[in-house]
């Protein structure tokens, strides 16, 4: 179907900075330290290849990756197909974030990544600590009061939480561009669904208590005829593709070696268990620590608090996919009416979860709209 997969792309072994400079773009690399000691790599593409001479402040755009992913998501295609490069060439000051636990955010001032304590986090902490620290850093560095936030998948989830619970942070967001938004996962058809059959008392037994490696857990649910061909074999053993789904028709297969070498970028077992709880409950709420006593210690209440997206007044534009297994259209349908400042919505009927970052036609379907909307915002 796909022929042989040849690892021919040099970016396979590169880090984020190297990938950016490989394509001839300027790169700045920073370390942001969160309030609880996590050290997150943040990259900046201050301008494009052809507009370095333009003086004056450029609007700041911050890109936040999704579940099991990293900042490389935004730069894994050729420059004319990668959102980070497209935005830089359009005259914007582009910043790429990383969430704790991924390849580029696996250090802490107090804990080693070999320790259980390092991995005791979920998307709650990404919203509570990672986003504020990174956005504060960008605001200070650029001297600009506001920025445009682009999130994909879990990058939207932590945006919903942070901007609805932290009003001072919300004030710093000019517009929130949400790609494949995830709040509730009540209707998800992703294989993440299968994790809900694992009882809480057995989750750590099966997956450990540090980084999430599904090993061969999902094999029992994968149709063997789908996963028999060489390239599909590679996808079928990759946690990102297992959980998000994949669509061979819209992929540039010559870039698959890059996608596979940089993904999954890693997250904690606790984070995956939080997502499992969300599938089970059908609700958008904080991590359930497993007992009323434990929850009281963390939240001063016996049940984990719900996240209320109606409290988020940031202007938001939403793109979702009709074939998205993780951000199911029914869940998106529940989300949209709750957004008090929804300024745009587009459903792309044939898009799946990863098409928003890697599809060959993503510029036409999504990115050009974002560029236009940011430029309208400048006026």
């Amino acid at each position: 179907l796909f022929g042989k997969l040849h690892p021919g792309s040099p970016e396979v072994t590169m880090n984020i900075s190297q990938m950016i400079t490989y394509w001839g773009y300027p790169n700045e690399e920073y370390e942001v330290v969160t309030e609880d000691g996590y050290i997150l790599e943040v990259n900046r593409i201050p301008y494009g290849k052809k507009n370095s001479g333009n003086t004056g402040q450029r609007p700041v755009v911050f890109l936040q990756h999704g579940l099991l992913a990293s900042a490389t998501n935004w730069i894994s295609n050729l420059p004319n197909n990668s959102l980070a490069f497209i935005l830089a060439d359009a005259g914007y000051d582009v910043w790429l974030g990383n969430s704790r636990g991924n390849t580029w955010a696996r250090r802490n001032l107090y804990y080693s990544p070999d320790s259980v304590e390092f991995w005791a986090f979920s998307f709650d902490e990404m919203a509570k600590y990672d986003l504020p620290a990174t956005i504060d850093f960008i605001v200070k560095k650029t001297g600009q009061k506001q920025l445009h936030y682009v999130g994909h998948s879990q990058g939207t989830t932590i945006g919903f939480i942070a901007f609805s619970t932290n009003p001072s942070l919300a004030k710093r967001i000019k517009t929130f561009y949400a790609l494949a938004p995830v709040a509730t996962v009540k209707y998800t058809k992703s294989l993440i669904n299968k994790l809900r059959f694992v009882p809480q008392s057995l989750f750590k037994f099966i997956f450990g208590d540090k980084i999430f490696y599904p090993h061969n857990f999902f094999d029992q649910f994968l149709a063997t005829e789908v996963c028999s061909r060489e390239m599909l074999n590679l996808l079928c053993s990759n946690a990102l593709f297992i959980i998000c789904g994949f669509d061979s028709k819209n992929f540039n297969t010559s870039r698959l070696d890059v996608y596979l070498s940089h993904n999954p970028a890693g997250t904690s077992v606790q984070n995956m268990f939080h997502w499992t709880q969300a599938v089970k409950s059908g609700k958008f709420q904080a991590y359930d620590w497993g007992s009323p006593v434990q929850n009281r210690m963390h939240y001063d209440q016996s049940q984990p608090p719900y996240y209320n997206v109606t409290a988020m007044n940031v202007p938001i534009a939403v793109w979702n996919g009709g074939k998205d297994l993780l951000a199911d259209p029914q869940d998106v349908g529940l989300l949209l009416p709750k957004l008090p400042n929804l300024i745009y919505h587009k459903e792309i009927p044939f898009y799946n979860h990863l098409d928003f970052i890697w599809a060959m036609d993503a510029p036409q379907e999504v990115y050009n709209d974002i560029v236009s909307m940011i430029s309208e915002d400048k006026k």
């Epitope: 320790s115 259980v116 009882p199 008392s201 057995l202 750590k204 037994f205 208590d209």
Partner: nanobody, 120 residues
């Protein structure tokens, strides 16, 4: 030193039954969870069934309705009753226990394995 010892493996005909046992010794704590994995030469070790100290169980799809996991918490012992055995159940079966004195000192403890061979 915590040690896990499996027993009960052997050769059985397709459709037959076996009962595997695994006993822990040297442990100063009760395991939070115990379970069984299996491995065929050249393949990854795979989960078969697990049981928590709260009695919650998990089975992989291929053994549901045929295998039953049980546990004696006080003895840190786990059993796997295997019936309607198939040739594809042939593997080395390993016992695993997970526990520790605190949530930050939990470890996985493994047995040496016991061979189960199902002939057609």
């Amino acid at each position: 030193q915590v040690q896990l010892q499996e027993s009960g493996g052997g050769l059985v005909q397709a459709g037959g039954s076996l009962r595997l046992s695994c006993a822990a010794s040297g442990s100063t704590f009760s395991f939070n969870a115990m379970g069984w994995y299996r491995q065929v030469p050249g393949k990854q070790r795979e989960l078969v069934a697990a049981i928590g100290n709260d009695g919650a169980t998990y089975y992989v799809d291929s053994v549901k309705g045929r295998f039953t996991i049980a546990r004696e918490n006080a003895k840190n012992t786990v059993y796997l009753q295997m019936s309607s055995l198939k040739p594809e159940d042939t593997a080395v079966y390993y016992c695993k226990g997970r526990g520790g004195l605190t949530q930050y000192s939990e470890h996985d403890y493994w047995g040496q394995g016991t061979q189960v061979t199902v002939s057609s």
